[in-house]
Amino acid sequence: MMTGTIETTGNISAEKGGSIILQCHLSSTTAQVTQVNWEQQDQLLAICNADLGWHISPSFKDRVAPGPGLGLTLQSLTVNDTGEYFCIYHTYPDGTYTGRIFLEVLESSVAEHGARFQIP
């Protein structure tokens, strides 16, 4: 039975040209995390494999940095980066947990962090 929950940074906003940390945290389970995949819509941005470390998509290697932890840092943001991001936690024995973050990249300096929320 899957007992864990994923806490994410929720709905967030950031300024064009700036950077943002996408963060998920898996709690309430003793399952072993084997791999975390970070996806933007249907595109794979990065993988963090428990044994073999971080792997970044060649399309994003100049703008994506691994961490902190299992999170992902997006740099040199553009308005095209606005959209949904998913952290997919592959675990044993539980299976797969998915967290969702919505990022809005703003032209002006009115960017604020949204509230944190949980996805079971």
């Epitope: 084997t34 791999q35 995949n37 794979l44 993988i47 494999n49 073999l52 470390g53 792997h55 970044i56 998509s57 060649p58 290697k61 592959h90 797969t96």
Partner: antibody, heavy 117, light 106 residues
Framework: EVQLQQSGPELQRPGASVKLSCKAS????????IYWLKQRPKQSLEIIGR????????YFVDKFKNRATLTTNTSSNTAYMQLSSLTSEDTAIYFC??????????WGQGVMVTASS | NIHLTQSPSLLSASVGDRVTLSCKGS??????LVWYQQKLGEAPKLLIY???NLQSGIPSRFSGSGSGTDYTLTISSLQPEDAATYFC????????FGSGTKLEIK
Amino acid sequence: EVQLQQSGPELQRPGASVKLSCKASGYTFTEHSIYWLKQRPKQSLEIIGRIDPKNGRTYFVDKFKNRATLTTNTSSNTAYMQLSSLTSEDTAIYFCARIDGFYFDFWGQGVMVTASS
Amino acid sequence: NIHLTQSPSLLSASVGDRVTLSCKGSQNVNKYLVWYQQKLGEAPKLLIYSTDNLQSGIPSRFSGSGSGTDYTLTISSLQPEDAATYFCYQYNNGFTFGSGTKLEIK
């Protein structure tokens, strides 16, 4: 043209060590991780580990953590794998491969290692 | 980690045939699937990445398809030089390879 040139075949006694080399050319050596993989007849390819030539950081699957050593020489664009305490189970073809993001795009030609008395 | 099963393990076909090779995952592979060709005594060569993208320089008779757990490599018109072993590889959960399909020319 990207190329990975591996050293020649090895015959070693059980219990001995072997050191294999993989010379890279045709790209910037420090920009891609090098993986080492093992292939035995009628079995799936198996990952041994990874090294980042940029900083020398290594990663291993559990099975090889205590027996494999990965190093690089960035001045000669060469990666090395040393495998110790050889047994007959280590008789296999070993490949080095470059990873581009999430998959291996160029491979060495492979080197046959035989552990036999 | 995901286990990949390839079928058949051995396939014999004639020049000009349309050939289909299968790769099935023990879990969802999420289209993060790659196909390699390995000729006897040679290194594997990248054919298809991300399920259906043809690697540069690979003939257009090779194509890939699939989703979820089930993936296919198709050779539309088999050529003599296609005799080889074909491996699938996934990176959705762990980095694992199938055990291969050996393709022989009749």
